[in-house]
């Protein structure tokens, strides 16, 4: 051989959404008379070398990844070596390497990011009755089922960041999932806004929740 | 516990040629690459190439590229690595070290099993 | 041409902690450069410690890690013992070709 098969992976992550499918774009350039006879490509953890899934000895060989893996056999012969992720889970979140031997041999790794959205937050407020402004209130901001851990952000109904007296936790369920708790303590004034956002830092998606106090009684803002 | 022995040592004209083999005992070449790595006297280590036996596919380093020609015969589970138009400053050790191409384990480590080592001289 | 540097010497003590870092050329370090770290004793064949960043060859002790740190792949010894007097050389995979680093001398004191 005069050069090693360059194999080709896009640099940026791919973004898969919980539940959806993925492709894992792998290509490499066959060189004129190519056959798949000749090919044998591998798709494997990067970190563990563990196989995903295999094209060897001019078939491909399946998937070794919880049956969720394709090949596009119709493309291999164009150089096209992509995998199809099906159901996308948290766990399968990493990095994938695409190895391609024809005379020679080489790789790439492509990274796959899993994300999911956050819920519209719920408001919670205690104590959560006859309050009076200089009461100390408790307020609570839930998101639910989200991916990867949210960054939660509190204000008032000026828009004035605040950041004392705010405690979040973000527990993972069986799923590797996000459901995020956001606690605010406030002295109550007069009357006021007070809002929360739940950013997912993968998506850039932005979920609001406000609870408005006005001496009493206090609202709550439909549904969006 | 596999091991890879490799061929004695050679005494070598400058312009000729060596063939050095690497064979696995105790176990296979499946599932593994075959590195040749060598190390001149005093210097540090240098890839010069590898090979898939199951597949018969080779990297070559460019350095060495067009002088060495790695080959392997699975059936016998042994690699050989042959240098020509050989020079004074090819004198060097030469190695073979196996590197999984596919955990079958889970678990990847690298380059863990070397050959002993074939000694090269090449001298007028 | 791809370039990789590593520390030229280390001194450490016995029963201490040391740390042998790879830089590459090419930018930082990842786990697709499957990091090796191969170890060398006078009169002796390498022997491969390390594969795969921060996988243990069978064998090596549990006293050798393996790493990346601020985008360089590192190797720590922790509790280090006479024995492991040795040069380090570490080993990167650039998709179609490996690249040892110089390798560092490690001297115990």
């Known amino acids: 051989p005069t050069g090693a098969v360059e194999v080709q992976v896009p640099e940026d992550p791919v973004v898969a959404l919980v539940g959806t499918d993925a492709t894992l774009r792998c290509s490499f350039s066959p060189e004129p008379g190519f056959s798949l006879a000749q090919l044998n490509l591998i798709w494997q953890l990067t970190d563990t070398k563990q196989l995903v899934h295999s094209f060897t000895e001019g078939r491909d060989q399946g998937s070794a990844y919880a049956n969720r893996t394709a090949l596009f056999p119709d493309l291999l012969a164009q150089g096209n070596a992509s995998l199809r992720l099906q159901r996308v889970r948290v766990a399968d979140e990493g990095s994938f390497t695409c190895f391609v031997s024809i005379r020679d041999f080489g790789s790439a790794a492509v990274s796959l990011q899993v994300a999911a959205p956050y819920s519209k937050p719920s408001m919670t407020l205690e104590p959560n009755k006859d309050l009076r402004p200089g009461d100390t209130v408790t307020i609570t901001c839930s998101s639910y089922r989200g991916y990867p851990e949210a960054e939660v952000f509190w204000q008032d109904g000026q828009g004035v960041p605040l950041t004392g007296n705010v405690t979040t936790s973000q527990m993972a369920n069986e799923q590797g999932l996000f459901d995020v708790h956001s606690v605010l303590r406030v002295v109550l004034g007069a009357n006021g806004t007070y809002s929360c956002l739940v950013r997912n830092p993968v998506l850039q998606q932005d979920a609001h929740g406000s609870v408005t106090i006005t001496g009493q009684p206090m609202t709550f803002p439909p549904e969006a | 516990q596999v091991q890879l022995v490799q061929s004695g040592a050679e005494v070598k004209k400058p312009g000729s040629s060596v063939k050095v083999s690497c064979k696995a005992s105790g176990g296979t070449f499946s599932n593994y690459a075959i590195n040749w790595v060598r190390q001149a006297p005093g210097q540090g280590l240098e890839w010069m190439g590898g090979i898939i036996p199951m597949w018969q596919s080779v990297n070559y380093a460019q350095k060495f590229q067009g002088r060495v020609t790695i080959t392997a015969d699975e059936s016998t589970s042994t690699a050989y690595m042959e240098l020509s138009s050989l020079r004074s400053d090819d004198t060097a050790v030469y190695y073979c070290?196996?590197?999984?191409?596919?955990?079958?384990?889970?678990?990847?480590?690298?380059?863990?099993?070397w050959g002993q080592g074939t000694t090269v001289t090449v001298s007028s | 041409d791809i370039q990789m540097t590593q520390e030229p010497s280390l001194t450490t003590s016995p029963g201490g902690t040391v740390t042998l870092t790879c830089r590459s050329s090419?930018?930082?370090?990842?786990?697709?450069?499957?990091a090796n770290w191969v170890q060398e004793k006078p009169g002796q064949a390498p022997r491969g410690l390390i594969g795969g960043t921060n996988k243990r060859a069978p064998g090596t002790p549990a006293r050798f890690s393996g790493s990346l740190i601020g985008g360089k792949a590192a190797l720590t010894i922790t509790g280090v013992q006479p024995e492991d007097e040795a040069i380090y050389f570490c080993a990167l995979w650039y998709s179609n070709l490996w690249v040892f680093g110089g390798g560092t001398k490690l001297e115990i004191k």
């Open positions: 070290a196996r590197d999984q191409v596919v955990a079958t384990s889970g678990v990847n480590f690298g380059m863990d099993v």
């Open positions: 090419t930018g930082a370090v990842t786990t697709s450069n499957y």
